[in-house]
Interface confidence: low
């Protein structure tokens, strides 16, 4: 349905309040070093012009498109050359180009300072004082540290902080109150956005076809009871929002996302019966309700599988007909079989059956060939079980802090060359799957940790990107997105790497680290051990825990001295001497 | 489908404690909002402390803070309410409810929660 105006269409669908916000997270998004007032005066000329479009959808460059608006808009920032160096030559394009121009220009690690928190009371005057400016100054600061964003997501976390911030400002113990809730919303934050990350690497990197392969399968296992015609419309629908999202298009991305749950809720009847409540919340929560919504039961009496995809004379003329849609069917099918598989085990599967297909149906007698398919299957299940038992048992074991340092020293081994940030970064994010899954029970706790595991190894593979410096990241990160996790799981030690250099400035520590939380802490202690095995990567685990037991006890000791900076440059001394002797370096 | 099995309640001296337990099945209690309500002798039903589904966010009533505490074992798949510091106000049939589908808002709004036990009566009195 073509409008003669597209800011008029979008300003009108999503009303001020949440056209502003989005054209702030695209904006941020875009040009994430920025200051916060510059991108706010980019905003309201922006939104102003909307608004003359609304009145007059025939006035001058109303009928222009939102990326030759918006683009425009941004390169009218005077410092983009010397902020952002060859990015400011994507002004010089026409579109569609300029936008795919600075698309390409998102950085996922922007060189940007850490957020502090400030105190409470800080904080609770600066929202009383200026709750606007305060909300706008999350959304800029969240979109602009994560470039890839759910847009109408994070309208969500907007909500939920605004309303942590009402609640907590006016209570008798206003830390106590709100700490816990934006711990929350960051951790969950933190997670959203990583989620979205790896549905826009899979779009991007793998194209729509992956995508969707993706959503057939975890639609499926969410809506079992729901048709394969239902599934696939709600499929489509879905890859339009996302492909927009990852794409810059927030605007028709936000406006997408809540017809598709319109039509989601007035079909629930047909789709699920775990809907009714997400149904009955406002827009935002609906959407994000709906997104999170558990599996409903599967039906009762589902035929065996194999007497479409096996046994059955038509499965080659079913599949040369239409292979994308027989293959869609068959992942459905699975998929709603097997609330108990992660997304990635499922789409394993429907490759090995595709790749069978492809060689039997031009066999002598394709049915012969195609019989024993799903025997095919057996290994690709348990190799995820195995391994998840394992590292559960050995998460159990451990304890959290202590499988991290595991991971840490396993993936320091398989891929040195990375640098130690990233390392630790992916290291402690692979090693939260214990806390996450391990206390499911056996049906729930693959889906959980394959998938989980899916998205930090993503991270790897988009930080990696940035600065490339491993054939074997390179190579586990773009071959297939699906087998990315055996991919690594399977690597071993890099044995053509060349030890790093001793340097004692590494393993120089001072008082300063007494009065770090104790995750920060942690990861300190993390950092050594990961620049331990780039210096012995033939250390044995033995000689690690020594070693790192010696540290902590250092760290504990110094940290109780009168003089803990004496303490810590003696002793630390005496540390590095006895660490080289231990591991012989 | 979640049931709910409330146990605990009984008579005590104002200052005293008991602990309610509330007992899940046909769903994982970390994956549920979970929350107390009770309702005293021709009251309307009154939200009392709630816990987020798969977060452990907590929250109180006004009037108990302080004195009631809010948990579950999701190994044991039960939510309990410790209350020490029992007044004569605190008299009323304690409820616990259920919204599954991870809120990780506890709501103090009743009609929200689809899922709710059959209470379990707390009197305080000398």
């Known amino acids: 349905d073509a409008h003669k105006s597209e800011v008029a269409h979008r300003f009108k669908d999503l009303g001020e309040e949440n056209f502003k916000a989005l054209v702030l997270i695209a904006f941020a998004q875009y040009l994430q070093q920025c200051p916060f007032e510059d991108h706010v005066k980019l905003v309201n000329e922006v939104t102003e012009f909307a608004k003359t479009c609304v009145a007059d959808e025939s006035a001058e460059n109303c009928d222009k498109s939102l990326h030759t608006l918006f683009g425009d808009k941004l390169c009218t920032v005077a410092t983009l050359r010397e902020t952002y160096g060859e990015m400011a030559d994507c002004c010089a394009k026409q579109e569609p180009e300029r936008n795919e121009c600075f698309l390409q220009h998102k950085d996922d690690n922007p060189n940007l300072p850490r957020l502090v928190r400030p105190e409470v009371d800080v904080m609770c005057t600066a929202f009383h004082d200026n709750e606007e400016t305060f909300l706008k100054k999350y959304l800029y600061e969240i979109a602009r540290r994560h470039p890839y964003f759910y847009a109408p997501e994070l309208l969500f976390f907007a909500k939920r902080y605004k309303a942590a911030f009402t609640e907590c400002c006016q209570a008798a113990d206003k830390a106590a109150c709100l700490l816990p809730k934006l711990d929350e919303l960051r951790d969950e934050g933190k997670a959203s956005s990583a989620k979205q990350r790896l549905k826009c690497a899979s779009l991007q990197k793998f194209g729509e076809r992956a995508f969707k392969a993706w959503a057939v399968a975890r639609l499926s296992q969410r809506f079992p009871k729901a048709e394969f015609a239902e599934v696939s419309k709600l499929v489509t629908d879905l890859t339009k929002v996302h492909t927009e999202c990852c794409h810059g298009d927030l605007l028709e991305c936000a406006d997408d996302r809540a017809d598709l749950a319109k039509y989601i809720c007035e079909n629930q009847d047909s789709i699920s019966s775990k809907l009714k409540e997400c149904c009955e919340k406002p827009l935002l929560e609906k959407s994000h309700c709906i997104a999170e919504v558990e599996n409903d039961e599967m039906p009762a009496d589902l035929p065996s599988l194999a007497a479409d995809f096996v046994e059955s004379k038509d499965v080659c003329k079913n599949y040369a007909e239409a292979k994308d849609v027989f293959l869609g069917m068959f992942l459905y099918e699975y998929a709603r079989r097997h609330p108990d598989y992660s997304v990635v085990l499922l789409l394993r599967l429907a490759k090995t059956y595709e790749t069978t297909l492809e060689k039997c149906c031009a066999a002598a007698d394709p049915h012969e060939c195609y019989a024993k398919v799903f025997d095919e299957f057996k290994p690709l299940v348990e190799e995820p079980q195995n391994l998840i038992k394992q590292n559960c048992e050995l998460f159990e074991q451990l304890g959290e802090y202590k499988f991290q340092n595991a991971l840490l020293v396993r993936y320091t081994k398989k891929v040195p060359q990375v640098s130690t940030p990233t390392l630790v970064e992916v290291s402690r994010n692979l090693g939260k799957v214990g806390s996450k899954c391990c206390k499911h029970p056996e049906a729930k706790r693959m889906p959980c940790a394959e998938d989980y595991l899916s998205v930090v190894l993503n991270q790897l593979c988009v930080l990696h990107e940035k600065t490339p410096v491993s054939d074997r990241v390179t190579k586990c990160c773009t071959e297939s997105l699906v087998n990315r996790r055996p991919c690594f799981s399977a690597l071993e030690v890099d044995e053509t790497y060349v030890p790093k250099e001793f340097n004692a400035e590494t393993f120089t520590f001072h008082a300063d680290i007494c009065t770090l939380s104790e995750k920060e802490r942690q990861i300190k202690k993390q950092t050594a051990l990961v620049e331990l095995v780039k210096h012995k990567p033939k250390a044995t685990k033995e000689q690690l825990k020594a070693v790192m037991d010696d540290f902590a006890a250092f760290v504990e000791k110094c940290c109780k001295a009168d003089d803990k900076e004496t303490c810590f440059a003696e002793e630390g001394k005496k540390l590095v001497a006895a660490s080289q002797a231990a591991l012989g370096l | 489908e979640v049931q709910l099995l409330e146990s605990g309640g009984g008579l005590v001296q104002p200052g005293g404690s008991l602990r309610l337990s509330c007992a899940a099945s046909?769903?994982?209690?970390?994956?549920?909002?979970v929350a107390w309500f009770r309702q005293a002798p021709g009251k309307g039903r009154e939200f009392v402390a709630g816990?987020?589904?798969?977060?452990?966010?907590?929250y109180y009533a006004d009037s108990v803070k302080g004195r009631f505490t809010i948990s579950r074992d999701n190994s044991k798949n039960t939510l309990y309410l410790q209350m020490n510091s029992l007044r004569p106000e605190d008299t009323a049939v304690y409820y616990c409810a259920a919204r599954p589908g991870r809120p990780l808002i506890t709501s103090k709004q009743a009609e929200l929660y689809p899922y709710w036990g059959q209470g379990t009566l707390v009197t305080v009195s000398s």
């Open positions: 046909g769903r994982y209690i970390d994956e549920t909002a």
């Open positions: 816990i987020g589904g798969g977060v452990d966010i907590t």
